[in-house]
C-alpha cells in the first residue's frame, strides 16, 4: 500500500485546515493508528494527535480543542485530521505516520500554508494645492500572504506607481497615486482597492480629495451704473470668489475709511440711501490659507439733476 497526501495544504487565516493522510492499501489491510506531528518546530517533532482504530482520537495538550477528525462517514483507512482555526504560527511542515497491519509503517509529510488577508491602510499625501505639478495624493499599503493586489478606483486623472517588499511567503505592497491638483478634483473620491485570495470581496478605503485654491475675485452690483444715484436705497456690492478652504472677505475703501452707515456682511457691502459721500474706490480682499486676491471698483454716485452719467470703472487686481 501507499500513503496519499498533499505536499501543500492552503488555508485562510481563521479557517479550518484539513490535513490529509489516506492509506491506500491492499484488500484485507488495516490501519492500526495514525500519529500526526509537526516536524519543523525546531528541535524534534511536536506531537499533534494520535488516531487509534480502537481507542479513537487523542490530542496532545498543545493542540487541545484544535484537532478533530473529519465529520462522518469515516473510512477506517483515512487518517486525515482537521486543524481548527488556523493561525499564522501553524504554517509549517507536518508528518503523518501510519501503522498498518500487516504491511508495517508508512509516513508522509505535507506543508501547511496559511493565507493571511491584508489589513490595508491609506495615507493621504501632503496638502494639495492648485498650481502644483505632479503631487502624491495618497499611498495605500497592504501586507499579506501571498502578496495582495493594490489598485485605485477613481474618476480623477492621475498616475500610479507600486513597490513591493517580500518576506518569506508574504509581501507588503504599496501603491501611490499621483496627480496634478486642480479645483475640479475637490470632493472627488479616491478609492484604494485591495484584492487577495483570502478575501471574500475586495477591501476598499476611500479618501476624499481636498485641493486648496482661490479663484480670481470680482465685484458684482455695478452692472447698471444708472442705478447708482443719490437717494437710491438698498444699493450693495457683492464680492465673488470661491476657494478651498472657503475664503473670508474684507472690504476697505482705498481713498479713505468706509463711510458711516455702510454695512459689511461677509462678501457683501450694503449702502444706506446713496449720497455723493459714497463715491470712491472700494476694495474687496479675499483670502484663505492658500492665497489672497483683491478686486477694486470705482463707485460714482450720480446726481439726477446733472444731465450726463458718469463712467464706472471696474479693475481687478491680484
Amino acid at each position: 500500500g501507499e500513503l496519499e497526501t498533499s505536499d501543500v495544504v492552503t488555508v485562510v487565516l481563521g479557517q479550518d485546515a484539513k490535513l490529509p493522510c489516506f492509506y491506500r492499501g491492499d484488500s484485507g489491510e488495516q490501519v492500526g493508528q495514525v500519529a500526526w506531528a509537526r516536524v519543523d518546530a525546531g528541535e524534534g517533532a511536536q506531537e499533534l494527535a494520535l488516531l487509534h482504530s480502537k481507542y479513537g482520537l487523542h490530542v496532545s495538550p498543545a493542540y487541545e480543542g484544535r484537532v478533530e477528525q473529519p465529520p462522518p462517514p469515516r473510512n477506517p483507512l483515512d487518517g486525515s485530521v482537521l486543524l481548527r482555526n488556523a493561525v499564522q504560527a501553524d504554517e509549517g511542515e507536518y508528518e503523518c505516520r501510519v501503522s498498518t497491519f500487516p504491511a508495517g509503517s508508512f509516513q508522509a509529510r505535507l506543508r501547511l500554508r496559511v493565507l493571511v488577508p491584508p489589513l490595508p491602510s491609506l495615507n493621504p499625501g501632503p496638502a494639495l494645492e492648485e498650481g502644483q505639478g505632479l503631487t502624491l495624493a495618497a499611498s495605500c499599503t497592504a501586507e499579506g500572504s501571498p502578496a495582495p493586489s493594490v489598485t485605485w478606483d477613481t474618476e480623477v486623472k492621475g498616475t500610479t506607481s507600486s513597490r513591493s517588499f517580500k518576506h518569506s511567503r508574504s509581501a507588503a505592497v504599496t501603491s501611490e497615486f499621483h496627480l496634478v491638483p486642480s479645483r475640479s478634483m475637490n470632493g472627488q473620491p479616491l478609492t484604494c482597492v485591495v484584492s487577495h485570495p483570502g478575501l471574500l470581496q475586495d477591501q476598499r478605503i476611500t479618501h476624499i480629495l481636498h485641493v486648496s485654491f482661490l479663484a480670481e475675485a470680482s465685484v458684482r452690483g455695478l452692472e447698471d451704473q444708472n442705478l447708482w444715484h443719490i437717494g437710491r436705497e438698498g444699493a450693495m456690492l457683492k464680492c465673488l470668489s470661491e476657494g478651498q478652504p472657503p475664503p473670508s472677505y474684507n472690504w476697505t475703501r482705498l481713498d479713505g475709511p468706509l463711510p458711516s452707515g455702510v454695512r459689511v456682511d461677509g462678501d457683501t457691502l450694503g449702502f444706506p440711501p446713496l449720497t455723493t459721500e459714497h463715491s470712491g474706490i472700494y476694495v474687496c480682499h479675499v483670502s484663505n490659507e492658500f492665497s489672497s486676491r483683491d478686486s477694486q471698483v470705482t463707485v460714482d454716485v450720480l446726481d439726477p439733476q446733472e444731465d450726463s452719467g458718469k463712467q464706472v470703472d471696474l479693475v481687478s487686481a491680484s
Partner: antibody, heavy 115, light 113 residues
Framework: EVQLVESGGGLVQPGGSLRLSCAAS????????MHWVRQATGKGLEWVSA???????YYPGSVKGRFTISRENAKNSLYLQMNSLRAGDTAVYYC?????????WGQGTTVTVSS | DIVMTQSPDSLAVSLGERATINCKSS????????????LAWYQQKPGQPPKLLIY???TRESGVPDRFSGSGSGTDFTLTISSLQAEDVAVYYC?????????FGQGTKVEIK
C-alpha cells in the same frame, strides 16, 4: 522526487538577450515562491529575482528593468528573460524554491556574456 | 537594502574541533509579528548548488546533522559546527529573507587544518 532543472544558458554578446527556464517536478509548483540566484566563477551568491505564488515579482537594482521573471504554473515552469546583458551578468544561474529560506535548488545553467 | 557581512572569510579547523562562523546584518531581520529571525545558512561544496542548513536563524532543515546549529537574533548570528567532519569542507553563506532585495553574506570557506 523534488527536482528543479535549469536550461537555456549559453554564450551571448553584450547587449544580447537570453531566456532561462526551470522545470519543476515532484511538488505543487503553484504553491511556492520561486527565485533565481546567480554565482560568478569563484564568487559568492547573488539574488537575482523572485516571483510569488500570485505572480508578484521582485528584483535587485542591478537587474531591474533588464530581467523579467515569470512562471507558468500549468507547465510547472519558471523563466528568466534577460535583456541588455553585460559582462558582469556572466555566472551560473540557479533556480530555487522558497519555503523557509531556499530549500530546493537546481544544478544551475551557465550564462557567458562575451564578445 | 540590507547588507550581510560574514567573518572570517576563511577558517581552518582540525577534524573533530568546533568551527564558528559569524554573520552580521546591517539592520534587524527579526520580524516582530511572529518573533522569528528571517535568516538562513547554506552550505556549498565545489561544483554543487547551495544546500539549506538552517532557517529562522536556529531551526535545522530536515536531514541536516545535529552538529550544525544556528544562534543569534536581530543583527548578529552564528553558525556553529560542533565537531568538524571531512565532509563539512565547503563554503558557508548566510542570507536574510526578511525583505527584498534578499541578500547573502560574502561566504566563509571552511577547511581542515
Amino acid at each position: 522526487e523534488v527536482q528543479l532543472v535549469e536550461s537555456g544558458g549559453g554564450l551571448v554578446q553584450p547587449g544580447g538577450s537570453l531566456r532561462l527556464s526551470c522545470a519543476a517536478s515532484g511538488f505543487t509548483f503553484s504553491s511556492y515562491d520561486m527565485h533565481w540566484v546567480r554565482q560568478a566563477t569563484g564568487k559568492g551568491l547573488e539574488w537575482v529575482s523572485a516571483i510569488g505564488t500570485v505572480g508578484d515579482t521582485y528584483y535587485p537594482g542591478s537587474v531591474k528593468g533588464r530581467f523579467t521573471i515569470s512562471r507558468e504554473n500549468a507547465k510547472n515552469s519558471l523563466y528568466l528573460q534577460m535583456n541588455s546583458l553585460r559582462a558582469g551578468d556572466t555566472a551560473v544561474y540557479y533556480c530555487a524554491r522558497e519555503w523557509n529560506g531556499m530549500d530546493v535548488w537546481g544544478q544551475g545553467t551557465t550564462v557567458t556574456v562575451s564578445s | 537594502d540590507i547588507v550581510m557581512t560574514q567573518s572570517p572569510d576563511s577558517l581552518a579547523v582540525s577534524l573533530g574541533e568546533r568551527a564558528t562562523i559569524n554573520c552580521k546584518s546591517s539592520q534587524s531581520v527579526l520580524y516582530n509579528s511572529n518573533n522569528k529571525n528571517y535568516l538562513a545558512w547554506y552550505q556549498q561544496k565545489p561544483g554543487q548548488p547551495p544546500k539549506l542548513l538552517i532557517y529562522w536563524a536556529s531551526t535545522r532543515e530536515s536531514g541536516v546533522p545535529d552538529r550544525f546549529s544556528g544562534s543569534g537574533s536581530g543583527t548578529d548570528f552564528t553558525l556553529t559546527i560542533s565537531s568538524l567532519q571531512a565532509e563539512d569542507v565547503a563554503v558557508y553563506y548566510c542570507q536574510q529573507f526578511y525583505t527584498t532585495p534578499y541578500s547573502f553574506g560574502q561566504g566563509t570557506k571552511v577547511e581542515i587544518k
